[in-house]
Each structure stands twice: as structure tokens, then as C-alpha cells.
Amino acid sequence: CDLPQTHSLGSRRTLMLLAQMRRISLFSCLKDRHDFGFPQEEFGNQFQKAETIPVLHEMIQQIFNLFSTKDSSAAWDETLLDKFYTELYQQLNDLEACVIQGVGVTETPLMKEDSILAVRKYFQRITLYLKEKKYSPCAWEVVRAEIMRSFSLSTNLQESLRSKE
């Protein structure tokens, strides 16, 4: 399954939107930094394309869920959020088209399920952090920075998969 060229453009637009969403000076938020334990090994180059697409799909779905909450709506600019949702939705569609084609359904399903579970647990840690920090502006900025980093790392994986073809 070949992801369209527009998919990587959409990924870059997503990162740009995340950068634009910033609302306060980040220098005041240093004390709120947190280790969310991004499961980097689940996005390693050792995986085949068949195995990574469902994991990438899970990653983007979880980002969508995180920023679709009422707490998120209160934290960010509504216009930017709407554009952000649109970009994520398009990327989910692109990845779903590959999943539907049955790519990787029979290949190492346990490895794939473990990776998906690791991504879900990562987002659970992010959600718990926000709750503990009472959804403060700094907590949201820390999460936004973390999502930019993890999304960027997963996007790099997509690019490396494309270049291997």
C-alpha cells in the first residue's frame, strides 16, 4: 500500500499547526517538564511497513482523541484546532485505506498488538499528567511539545519507509 505524497505534506502541516498553537512563553513552564516515556522502540527502523502502519494509525488516532476533549478546546485556539483536526482526519483516512487492504494482517500480529498497546499506555500517561496538573496552560504546553516530538519521530519513520521502497 502506497501512502499518497499528500500524506507527508499533511504531516508537515500538522507539525506547523502544532507550532502555531503555542499560547504562552515556554520559558515559564520548565518546572512542568515530564518524562512521558515515548515508546521509541515501537517506531524503530527494524519494522516492516506492514507492521508500522497500524501503529502509526494508533498514534494519530490517540493524538486526535487527546485534542478532541473539552479541556483541549478550552486550551487552544478554535480555528487552529479545527485545521488540526482536518489534517489528522485526512492522515487517518490515508492509513485506514492501507489497513483495509489487509497489509500486515497475517504478519507478526503479536508484535503489532504489543506496539499498539505501548502507544495507548503512552497516551494514558499523558492524559494522567494533564489531569494531575489540572489542565494548566503550562501542562498543555508541555504536552504540545511532547506531541510535536513524538509525531515528528513517527513521521520520520513514515519517510524512511517510503525511501526504502
Epitope: 520548565l30 512542568d32 518524562d35 512521558f36 508541555v142 511539545a145 516530538r149
Partner: antibody, heavy 121, light 107 residues
């Protein structure tokens, strides 16, 4: 390979202006902040200030506020430290270093080689 | 500003010795503390971040501990290349501040 390359040594007279640079390569320049550190001859490290190159937001140590200006040009992945009127007491080695911002990652993990600034009449 | 105080300011030790340097913050900094090594004429090098995390490529003889206001850098068995000046730095709030440094010299 991540690198921060600083401009060469400078010899200036009191009252002159100066702008030194720090060019980042091998990583996404806007994903990290750039900090500046002073080390006077035979002395310890002093933190001067920091810049977020993604939007040029800056913060200074009170000791250096109004004495220096930190800027960045993200189009050429370069941060700057400048003086409008140098004093003899500005004679020091100046280092730039990258910082991961709000991300959980090693602070100041890569440093420039340093720029020696000598101010003498 | 948060003040960082290192002790001792200098120490003499022999190759193979266990060396301990302490750093005290004027207020709680949780675990937001870094340790750097600097050799003459060179840029500082990050050894430990977040109080106890070993930076990639740094030998395991270096370790860090502590939280709140009191922190320690330990070199388990001093090597010839470890003779240098060591600095702690708080990373919880701006302005970031460094300790005054500890010079480790050959006995």
C-alpha cells in the same frame, strides 16, 4: 552529526559593537532552544540567556539583561549574541549550547567550541 | 534566582579513588539538576541530566543522585582523563544557574 559551530575569536576596543554567531547543523534547529554561557578568564560558568529560534522568544539572566542581545535567524540555523558597546569586563570565552525546551531530553547536550572575545584599548 | 553551592571547591585524588562532589540548591529543584565536566581550553561536556540519568557516551563510573536541594556526583574509580573541573546546574527555572565548580586535581 549534531554540531554547533561558533564564529572565530574577536579582539575589540572598548565602546565598539560586536555580534558573534552559533550555527547549528545535524538537527532541527527550531526544535531546540539555544543558550549562551560566559566564562571569564580562570572563572566558572555563567548563564547569560536563551532563545527559542522557532519564534525568537528570549529570556535573560538579570545580570545580563540590557547588556547583551540574543537573536536568531532560523532560515540559516544561526543564533547570535551581540553587544552595542563593549567593556573591558566583557573579555571572556562565550559558549552556545542547545536545550530541548519543554521536551524531556538531556539539557545542553551539545556545545559550541566557544568564541574568545578580548576587549582592550 | 536559585543559588547553587558546590563543595569542595577543589580536591586532590589519585587514580582509582572514589570521588564525591556535592551540590546544594537554595530551594527545592526536584530532580532538575545537571552535571558537566570541563577540561582546560574545552567546552563543558554534559555528564548527568535529571539528577541521575547518564548522558549517552559517558562512562558508567560517573553517577548522580539526590533530589530536592541536595545532590551528589560520584566517580567510582577516578581515571587519568577525569582530572577536570565539574559544575552542577539547576534546570527547573530561569535564570539557569551553575555552581561555582569543583576542580579535581592529581594528588
Amino acid at each position: 552529526e549534531v554540531q554547533l559551530v561558533q564564529s572565530g575569536a574577536e579582539v575589540k576596543k572598548p565602546g565598539e559593537s560586536l555580534k558573534i554567531s552559533c550555527k547549528g547543523s545535524g538537527y532541527s534547529f527550531t526544535s531546540y532552544w539555544i543558550g549562551w554561557v560566559r566564562q571569564m578568564p580562570g572563572k566558572g560558568l555563567e548563564w547569560m540567556g536563551i532563545i527559542d529560534p522557532s519564534d525568537s522568544d528570549t529570556a535573560y539572566s538579570p545580570s545580563f539583561q540590557g547588556q547583551v542581545t540574543i537573536s536568531a535567524d532560523k532560515s540559516i540555523s544561526t543564533a547570535y549574541l551581540q553587544w552595542s558597546s563593549l567593556k573591558a569586563s566583557d573579555t571572556a570565552m562565550y559558549y552556545c549550547a542547545r536545550h530541548p525546551g519543554l521536551n524531556w531530553a538531556p539539557d545542553f547536550d551539545y556545545w559550541g567550541q566557544g568564541t574568545l572575545v578580548t576587549v582592550s584599548s | 534566582d536559585i543559588q547553587m553551592t558546590q563543595s569542595p571547591s577543589s580536591l586532590s585524588a589519585s587514580v582509582g579513588d572514589r570521588v564525591t562532589i556535592t551540590c546544594r540548591a537554595s530551594q527545592s529543584i526536584n530532580r532538575f539538576l545537571n552535571w558537566y565536566q570541563q577540561k582546560p581550553g574545552k567546552a563543558p561536556k554534559l555528564l548527568i541530566y535529571a539528577a541521575s540519568s547518564l548522558q549517552s557516551g559517558v562512562p558508567s563510573r560517573f553517577s548522580g543522585s539526590g533530589s530536592g536541594t541536595d545532590f551528589t556526583l560520584t566517580i567510582s574509580s577516578l581515571q587519568p582523563e577525569d582530572f577536570a573541573t565539574y559544575y552542577c546546574q539547576q534546570a527547573i527555572d530561569l535564570p539557569f544557574t551553575f555552581g561555582q565548580g569543583t576542580k579535581v586535581e592529581i594528588k
